[in-house]
Interface confidence: low
Amino acid sequence: RKIPKVGHTFFQKPESCPPVPGGSMKLDIGIINENQRVSMSRNIESRSTSPWNYTVTWDPNRYPSEVVQAQCRNLGCINAQGKEDISMNSVPIQQETLVVRRKHQGCSVSFQLEKVLVTVGCTCVTPVIHHVQ
Amino acid sequence: GITIPRNPGCPNSEDKNFPRTVMVNLNIHNRNTNTNPKRSSDYYNRSTSPWNLHRNEDPERYPSVIWEAKCRHLGCINADGNVDYHMNSVPIQQEILVLRREPPHCPNSFRLEKILVSVGCTCVTPIVHHVA
């Protein structure tokens, strides 16, 4: 499988573009919109019929160092009586994000972009039933 | 920035924090192919809080295509297949990092950008806060 390349050949290179060594790209990690606020409905992770917990993974050689992952609390979904209904399934919803990975090779340091799959939350679904012949 | 434990034998000039600008290999290391979520999972249709997926395309961004979820209903689908308005479908939102071409149109110069995407929907009970 080919690893996807970020550079697009169809872009006309303006004169103002910074010079970049072949096979690499310049990346400014001062984040645009760093201070924007998420306006999610309050504590949906515990109000959901497919509730989830959060855990924080921390890696000093990754930027950003903190990545929050969700895990579904139940296999089934929570019904109106507050009981788990195993005729339904809690399933994770996932989203890809980019991180910058720092690699140490002896005393030299290199940087690599990496796609990370983040579990964002859970949703309640009707199970797929496979009929066995 | 973040602090890195350094190899004690390395010269002191190395910065412990991530520098503001880095040179990065053009190849993205990943184990996940960038798939259309409609093909990778049918949760959007099977969920009790189903959603539609909308294609958001921007050639100045990497990835250039991002799929945005929009809940189909205000309520949730009950066991009879009807919408139950005593429950609410709400979007699950996530901040993700993408690359923004900077300066614009440059093929190999980027800046990290944080964007908010709705990834899917979940069914919740409406909540009540008692205010003192």
Partner: nanobody
Framework: EVQLVESGGGLVQAGGSQRLSCTAS????????MGWYRQAPGKQRELVAL???????DYADSVKGRFTISRDNAKNTVYLEMNSLKAEDTAVYYC??????????????????WGQGTQVTVSS
């Protein structure tokens, strides 16, 4: 409490146009979603169109290209512009909104609210 008041229903000829409006009033803190559902005689209530706080909209396949939803955030009002109306568009149209609001010292962060409905009749 929160109230949704619709206006603009009535009798219209097939192929004609109609504009519905709905205003939310009360101790509203924020409106996440506003939109329209409809219910034809003997049928279930169905989604017509929703508009989200960011401005993006969703439409039922049956009305795409004919109906346009818009929103005036300052007035807490949602509009539904209906063009090329067909007999099958005849229904009671209900305004709906997911709203965060205060009531009796209590803050409800996300609750669905409904208008009383307005009748739209398309005659052929």
């Amino acid at each position: 409490e929160v109230q949704l008041v619709e206006s603009g229903g009535g009798l219209v000829q097939a192929g004609g146009s109609q504009r519905l409006s709905c205003t939310a009033s009360g101790t509203i803190v924020n409106i996440h979603v506003m939109g329209w559902y409809r219910q034809a005689p003997g049928k279930q209530r169905e989604l017509v169109a929703l508009i989200f706080s960011g401005g993006s909209a969703d439409y039922a396949d049956s009305v795409k290209g004919r109906f346009t939803i818009s929103r005036d955030n300052a007035k807490n009002t949602v509009y539904l512009e209906m063009n090329s109306l067909k007999a099958e568009d005849t229904a009671v149209y209900y305004c709906a909104a997911e709203i965060g609001y205060y009531s009796g010292g209590t803050y409800y962060s996300s609750e669905a609210h409904w208008g009383q409905g307005t009748q739209v009749t398309v005659s052929s």
